[in-house]
Amino acid sequence: IVLRPSRVHNSEENTMRALTLKDILNGTFSYKTFFPNWISGQEYLHQSADNNIVLYNIETGQSYTILSNRTMKSVNASNYGLSPDRQFVYLESDYSKLWRYSYTATYYIYDLSNGEFVRGNELPRPIQYLCWSPVGSKLAYVYQNNIYLKQRPGDPPFQITFNGRENKIFNGIPDWVYEEEMLATKYALWWSPNGKFLAYAEFNDTDIPVIAYSYYGDEQYPRTINIPYPKAGAKNPVVRIFIIDTTYPAYVGPQEVPVPAMIASSDYYFSWLTWVTDERVCLQWLKRVQNVSVLSICDFREDWQTWDCPKTQEHIEESRTGWAGGFFVSTPVFSYDAISYYKIFSDKDGYKHIHYIKDTVENAIQITSGKWEAINIFRVTQDSLFYSSNEFEEYPGRRNIYRISIGSYPPSKKCVTCHLRKERCQYYTASFSDYAKYYALVCYGPGIPISTLHDGRTDQEIKILEENKELENALKNIQLPKEEIKKLEVDEITLWYKMILPPQFDRSKKYPLLIQVYGGPCSQSVRSVFAVNWISYLASKEGMVIALVDGRGTAFQGDKLLYAVYRKLGVYEVEDQITAVRKFIEMGFIDEKRIAIWGWSYGGYVSSLALASGTGLFKCGIAVAPVSSWEYYASVYTERFMGLPTKDDNLEHYKNSTVMARAEYFRNVDYLLIHGTADDNVHFQNSAQIAKALVNAQVDFQAMWYSDQNHGLSGLSTNHLYTHMTHFLKQCFSLSD
């Protein structure tokens, strides 16, 4: 059981107050984290509270401002990037968001040696992506879908690609589906370790069907937004990978990296690129039917002036029980010999673990094992491997950092974080300096988050970087809800849940229950993290019990649970939420006449199906930006879990798993359907089709749209959304306003 330390004593009760909705909407109780911007083994940059860019040297204890807030303000910079030779800084301003990761901006180059902005050969605007080379001060940038190279910031640019075209050909940046569902970045170019080569992806979207929606704006006529967006079964982008020698870019030009024959024989994806050395690169490819992944190690052949990917350096990863990997196929972390690597994939028992691959995947040496999962490899040095896992005390929703000594035999394992601040910190991530000389630990909870700096050899804590003292003080007079994380054992399935309980929770009383669900494949909702959010308010002020349940399809508990939903989305995720609700009712403190469910995105899909399950368990529910049919969602994501919507593949389940097919079952529940009209991700089409089906079935429901809002419903829409949902739930639960 994880209980938030209670600060409620009878004598203090009258000075304590419950959370308000306003607290949540104002972000009153938000926390800070500290991630050093490492620039060497012992130095990092950090933007101070007054917006100076300060360089810290851990070993000398000295710090100095490298860029003043005055310089930042002179171009309204919101971000910066120091060149590795420390001669220049780029300043980023005019940030303009595009999709989840992508944005455009204006860039200015500031010369630290003379304290002036670089004049002459200024960068065009707006730029889609810009980055320094890893050594020196070469610049690569993407402008109007083409890649440019500068040897020095003041030099004229060398144009690498010429075929870039809006919505057609993307060079060095991903198209919509690669950005959202495969790379999870705004960029698709990668410098080699010493900046000799620049690799980039070219995405050809010429034949992809386009999603079009209205953007109403303020003009007389709405604009139409057009995005090449492959839905399930549609034509996909065609990807090619090129590498150019940045020292002699005009010599042979960009050289295409060959696709492994077994991948190229049918539709495929490029999934990631990892540089090993300046003359060795590792590419990962994935068949469109995403159960086969190939990792290909390619060498630069000076005699060919191109890249050689011998079959002997192809490593195949295949899943026979589901899709390849977790959410994504894991990426390799290469060791110092520049050919062997460490990688997370399923072991013979179906748990994701670290393996060491020297020659073939078949001969891989398993490094971690157990009925838990290795989650991320942070760093491999000559003698240590740092990784995170959820092994400690068998709580899948925790993250601790471990060190394995790989320099000694047999390797020894040490948990770096397990006993540091055991009650406060059970969910960590880490950020390492060069050669792991030092590292920062960022603890996300369950207590108030704290960031600390550590010695990479001894693991000794050097200093606290951020401990959120102001937040701690602000919370002293707040009645926070209690939280507990426990598990249910049902039919050989373990269902972990988090329950958020009102501050004066009394087991002998009855409380309304709200299920918050996401439930998407390879997700995890039950995590030992700190949060003061809308559901905290609902428990604290409105006296609701809120529960989050990780059912089948969720991550980090083995392949049996994860791959249970393969090819049948919308079945077990819903079943497991319903099963959990029944178990909660049995606990005796739930008012079974006042149970609701809500979710966003995939959670909106699950909540809709749960409401339409015909169980009579739910009085009401909310779906925000739900998927309503898998035929409407992106190919890369959907087909990973569902296969293709064709007769000879899985069309039948595509049709059976829609929300619309269950329209009749909404008759006995109160349903609130919410969607942004400019949702580029889960298109408004999804909710439009639910609404149409409900109208056609003559079923009453409530709905709210947010004009020109995307999948995140940000800004003022957020306030309106949570206010609206609060009213809906309070009405459903007969709670007075």
């Epitope: 020292t247 002699y248 010599y251 060959p258 696709v259 024959a261 190229a264 052949r301 000076e302 005699d303 060919w304 002036q305 191109t306 050689d308 990917c309």
Partner: antibody
Framework: QVQLVQSGAEVKKPGASVKVSCKAS????????IHWVRQAPGQGLEWMGW????????KYAQKLQGRVTMTTDTSTSTAYMELRSLRSDDTAVYYC?????????????WGQGTLVTVSS | EIVLTQSPGTLSLSPGERATLSCRAS??????????MHWYQQKPGQAPRLLIY???NLESGIPDRFSGSGSGTDFTLTISRLEPEDFAVYYC?????????FGQGTKLEIK
């Protein structure tokens, strides 16, 4: 037109060293790899290694590693191959050859050859 | 290393005849893009001369009676109608892997 002109014949004693030169003309010297290939009397061709004048990259055949050194002088567009600790079985005609731009490993122009005789 | 075996060792033919020379590699010298096999001609007292590069591409200035074919491990040099000046030693060479290797040569002699 492309030409590779090699230095003259050499007679060396076992244990000595020899340095053969190869002067290039008719093209941009730095752009192409220079290979060295040898041919013992009445025998086939044996690849010794290459040097890339632009990058300074050098690859040697395993069996000659430690005894051979390839260098270039870009100011004179000349490549050099030095072989040390000569043995009688090093007696051969030594060729320099230009790496063909599109050939990806084919040698499109050859020097006339330098006969090195190792004899006591 | 990749071993190249040429056959026959000696080929005796008359001018005007068709010559077929073979080269077999101990492992594939092809990728999805190219076959890294090249052919040279060497006459006594002369340096080798490039005839065919990347298995089938005719080097400029070489008569079109010379042609190359093959992929993977088996390659062929064909001279469609032998001319008197074609009688020489022919070598195949691979650049698929380092070290580069040559075949032992096929001697084409006048019958």
């Amino acid at each position: 037109q492309v030409q590779l002109v090699q230095s003259g014949a050499e007679v060396k004693k076992p244990g000595a060293s020899v340095k053969v030169s190869c002067k290039a003309s008719g093209y941009t010297f730095t752009e192409n790899i220079i290979h060295w290939v040898r041919q013992a009397p009445g025998q086939g061709l044996e690849w010794m290694g290459w040097i890339h004048p632009a990058s300074g990259s050098i690859k040697y055949a395993q069996k000659l590693q430690g005894r051979v050194t390839m260098t270039t002088d870009t100011s004179t567009s000349t490549a050099y191959m030095e072989l040390r600790s000569l043995r009688s079985d090093d007696t051969a005609v030594y060729y320099c050859a230009r790496h063909g731009g599109t050939g990806r490993g084919a040698m499109d122009y050859w020097g006339q050859g330098t006969l090195v005789t190792v004899s006591s | 290393e990749i071993v190249l075996t040429q056959s026959p060792g000696t080929l005796s033919l008359s001018p005007g005849e068709r010559a077929t020379l073979s080269c077999r590699a101990s492992q594939s010298v092809s990728t999805s893009a190219y076959s890294y096999m090249h052919w040279y001609q060497q006459k006594p007292g002369q340096a080798p001369r490039l005839l065919i590069y990347l298995a089938s591409n005719l080097e400029s200035g070489i008569p079109d009676r010379f042609s190359g074919s093959g992929s993977g491990t088996d390659f062929t040099l064909t001279i469609s109608r032998l001319e008197p000046e074609d009688f020489a030693v022919y070598y195949c060479q691979q650049s698929r892997e380092l070290p580069y290797t040559f075949g032992q040569g096929t001697k084409l002699e006048i019958k």
